[in-house]
Amino acid sequence: LIIGFGISGRHSITVTTVASAGNIGEDGILSCTFEPDIKLSDIVIQWLKEGVIGLVHEFKEGKDELSEQDEMFRGRTAVFADQVIVGNASLRLKNVQLTDAGTYKCYIITSKGKGNANLEYKTGAFSMPEVNVDYNASSETLRCEAPRWFPQPTVVWASQVDQGANFSEVSNTSFELNSENVTMKVVSVLYNVTINNTYSCMIENDIAKATGDIKVTESEIKRRSHLQLLNSKAS
């Protein structure tokens, strides 16, 4: 995590943001904190987006002030009003869209001074993979499925026993467009698997990396999944 500070003017306050990623169709958080003030009425929060004329969100005098809000954000933004007093200016964004990606500025005014910091917000789709034994196949086969990804990810198989092995010749990956015509379902099949081994299906794009593990023994099957967002930086 890289911490940086946004400072402005002679009377300046520290504003800290964290670069993050939004999962399209879900809610997102644009993270911003600042040196708190003792009076809520003295705090002004403005969220702006590069290339957008209107405001993303404004909070001042203890309430939301959205008369200048840009049309693309109408009805989709909220601050955590009860946490503003303790220095939380983070913005909740409803139903994240691909077009929400870009550079945002969190601009703060308090009785102590002013400050701002930029935030890079990426948007895409990412989901947890699930790995199962495909009993319908003629040979021992594993099937890795993840319901929503965008942009199109890469899929790599690995195994605990055959570390460093390249499974591209014995696997097949397909991408099926979902009904909203943006995200895709990822299906990858691994053939000729051996028993008493742990296999990992790794799905990655420039936003997220997800891994689905399956351990197959004669007596049981164990599964585990993990998802990690990439490039979360503070500034």
Epitope: D64, L66, S67, Q69, A78
Partner: antibody
Framework: QVQLQQSGPGLVQPSQSLSITCTVS????????IHWVRQSPGKGLEWLGV???????DYNAAFISRLSISKDNSKSQVFFKMNSLQSDDTAIHYC?????????????WGQGTLVTVSA | NIVMTQSPKSMSMSVGERVTLSCKAS??????VSWYQQKPEQSPKLLIY???NRYTGVPDRFTGSGSATDFTLTISSVQAEDLADYHC?????????FGSGTKLEIK
């Protein structure tokens, strides 16, 4: 405290237009959007449209050709106008305010205006 | 349009019984579901917003749960004053839509 007060006619002739005013108090129209919802006799609720704090609007596509929502921030008033009413537009019309600036639930409702479309 | 299907259409319960009302969305609406109580000749009253958040002043016998497409309103111990119509609604995407309602009668 937050209040929404509706005023408008109870009887409308077929093919005529309906105008309802929603006057709000306890909050500013520059902070919250105002939604319009109707309820036909013995039926469920139907969302008609919203005017946001910025003045931009979103309408139910089924009514977009004959519905207009506007407001006067300084008077804390929202104006609802629907044209070309027919008998199946007979309903109680409500204005409502959301609990947050993101539409999550209508916490405050007007008292409702019963509109009967009849010759 | 997203269709919200409520079940049952009506139900008759005795005071003290547990009541479970169902609301199913035709597609994913996240947690953007709210529940309303409407008594005869009154405007609807918000009970639950964001699928599971109880609105201020609502008795804690009312609980909302669910996400994506399946939602539930539970009244842990129904009271005589709970006689009303109950509506669910989604505010995830336009047009916002409501279920057709469940009428709760008290035996």
């Amino acid at each position: 405290q937050v209040q929404l007060q509706q005023s408008g006619p109870g009887l409308v002739q077929p093919s005529q237009s309906l105008s309802i005013t929603c006057t709000v108090s306890g909050f500013s129209l520059t902070s919250y959007g105002i939604h319009w919802v109707r309820q036909s006799p013995g039926k469920g609720l139907e969302w008609l449209g919203v005017i946001w704090s910025s003045g931009s609007t979103d309408y139910n596509a089924a009514f977009i050709s004959r519905l207009s929502i506007s407001k006067d921030n300084s008077k804390s008033q929202v104006f609802f106008k629907m044209n070309s009413l027919q008998s199946d537009d007979t309903a109680i019309h409500y204005c409502a305010r959301d609990i947050t600036t993101i539409a999550e639930g209508f916490a405050y409702w007007g008292q409702g205006t019963l509109v009967t479309v009849s010759a | 349009n997203i269709v919200m299907t409520q079940s049952p259409k009506s139900m008759s319960m005795s005071v003290g019984e547990r009541v479970t009302l169902s609301c199913k969305a035709s597609e994913n609406v996240g947690t953007y579901v709210s529940w309303y109580q409407q008594k005869p000749e009154q405007s609807p009253k918000l009970l639950i917003y964001g699928a599971s958040n109880r609105y201020t002043g609502v008795p804690d016998r009312f609980t909302g749960s669910g996400s994506a497409t399946d939602f539930t309103l539970t009244i842990s111990s129904v009271q005589a004053e709970d006689l009303a119509d109950y509506h669910c609604g989604q505010s995830y995407s336009y047009p916002f839509t409501f279920g057709s309602g469940t009428k709760l009668e008290i035996k």
